[in-house]
Interface confidence: low
């Protein structure tokens, strides 16, 4: 089975603009690519399956996404802890200043899809 987690965080050193509402723009695609790459670095262990549903919202830039892991390999607390530990590295590697991290379980039945 697969476990899903909803993650939200702020990137306080970026400005939201209308191009982040349009997945065809360079800004949207570059930010999406860099965030995807970042998460592959954070959750390197075998249980990480990927992420989906990246959305950008106003408020500097608010990022919302869903993370997928093999069932039983990680819990909400560890997802949040690992992400918070990575914030310094995110600043250096990806020029992203991250704050206001929030993680929650994606409730059944979505998590039952595997």
């Amino acid at each position: 089975g697969v476990s899903f987690f909803f993650l939200s965080f702020h990137i306080s050193n970026l400005q939201f603009n209308s191009s982040l509402e349009d997945p065809s723009t360079d800004y949207y695609q570059e930010l999406q690519r860099d965030i995807s790459e970042m998460f592959l670095q954070i959750y390197k262990q075998g249980g990480f399956l990927g992420l989906s549903n990246i959305k950008f919202r106003p408020g500097s830039v608010v990022v919302q996404l869903t993370l997928a892991f093999r069932e039983g390999t990680i819990n909400v607390h560890d997802v949040e802890t690992q992400f918070n530990q990575y914030k310094t590295e995110a600043a250096s590697r990806y020029n992203l200043t991250i704050s206001d991290v929030s993680v929650s379980d994606v409730p059944f039945p979505f998590s039952a899809q595997s």
């Epitope: 570059e30 860099d34 310094t88 590295e89 600043a91 250096s92 590697r93 990806y94 020029n95 992203l96």
Partner: antibody, heavy 123, light 111 residues
């Protein structure tokens, strides 16, 4: 003052291993990557990989994977680079360097370097 | 891997004249508007010294005759008025993707 002080020169035989140390001082050791770069005689610079001392996370250049190991001792603020199965082409000066930021955290770059450790591989 | 092609291999310039070194990346080194390219100066027997970070920012304490420019794949280091102490080898470095890669170096001499 940020300083990286490396261990002394080494002479090794082919097939042996070498372990070079890099002691950091003058800054918070844990959150900054330490890079390892080597330079063969008369040649350019080559990135070997890096370690984040606080977590032990490492990234290696595939060219050296399996032969090089980075470790960190946070009690002594020291990083180690061990290279095994040495061959003559490994004769080089090995540098450690800090991937650091300015005081405002406004940029990151390899800003401070150790003095270099000469490793000679010869039978 | 990102290949950094530096040119020329060597450069002889008269004192007080301009020296220009180029570095071309095999793919973009830009990330969210920041170009992750850095320039270093190395003198014999010494470790490299950071001159320019993020393509165009002058490191603290570096003389302002050094400047960097460029974006995405093409970058330039300029010494506006060469001084005797600038004789050295200059390297570009990309830190956009692992493995980080250096240019092959440019040796700057006095003509």
């Amino acid at each position: 003052e940020v300083q990286l002080v490396q261990s002394g020169a080494e002479v090794k035989k082919p097939g042996a291993s070498v372990k070079v140390s890099c002691k950091a001082s003058g800054y918070r050791f844990i959150p900054y990557w330490i890079e390892w770069v080597r330079q063969a005689p008369g040649q350019g610079l080559e990135w070997m990989g890096e370690i984040l001392p606080g977590t032990g996370r490492t990234n290696y250049n595939e060219k050296f994977k399996g032969r090089v190991t980075f470790t960190a001792d946070t009690s002594t603020n020291t990083v180690y680079m061990e290279l095994s199965s040495l061959r003559s082409e490994d004769t080089a000066v090995y540098y450690c360097a800090r991937y650091g930021d300015d005081t405002s955290g406004g940029y990151y770059a390899v800003d401070y370097w150790g003095q270099g450790t000469t490793v000679t591989v010869s039978s | 891997d990102i290949v950094m092609t530096q040119s020329p291999d060597s450069l002889a310039v008269s004192l007080g004249e301009r020296a220009t070194i180029n570095c071309r990346a095999s793919e973009s080194v830009n990330i969210l508007g920041t170009n992750l390219i850095h320039w270093y100066q190395q003198k014999p027997g010494q470790p490299p010294k950071l001159l320019i970070y993020h393509a165009s920012n002058l490191e603290t304490g570096v003389p302002d005759r050094f400047s960097g420019s460029g974006s995405r794949t093409d970058f330039t280091l300029t010494i506006s008025s060469l001084q005797a102490e600038d004789v050295a080898v200059y390297y570009c470095l990309q830190s956009r993707k692992i493995p980080w890669t250096f240019g092959g170096g440019t040796k700057v001499e006095i003509k």
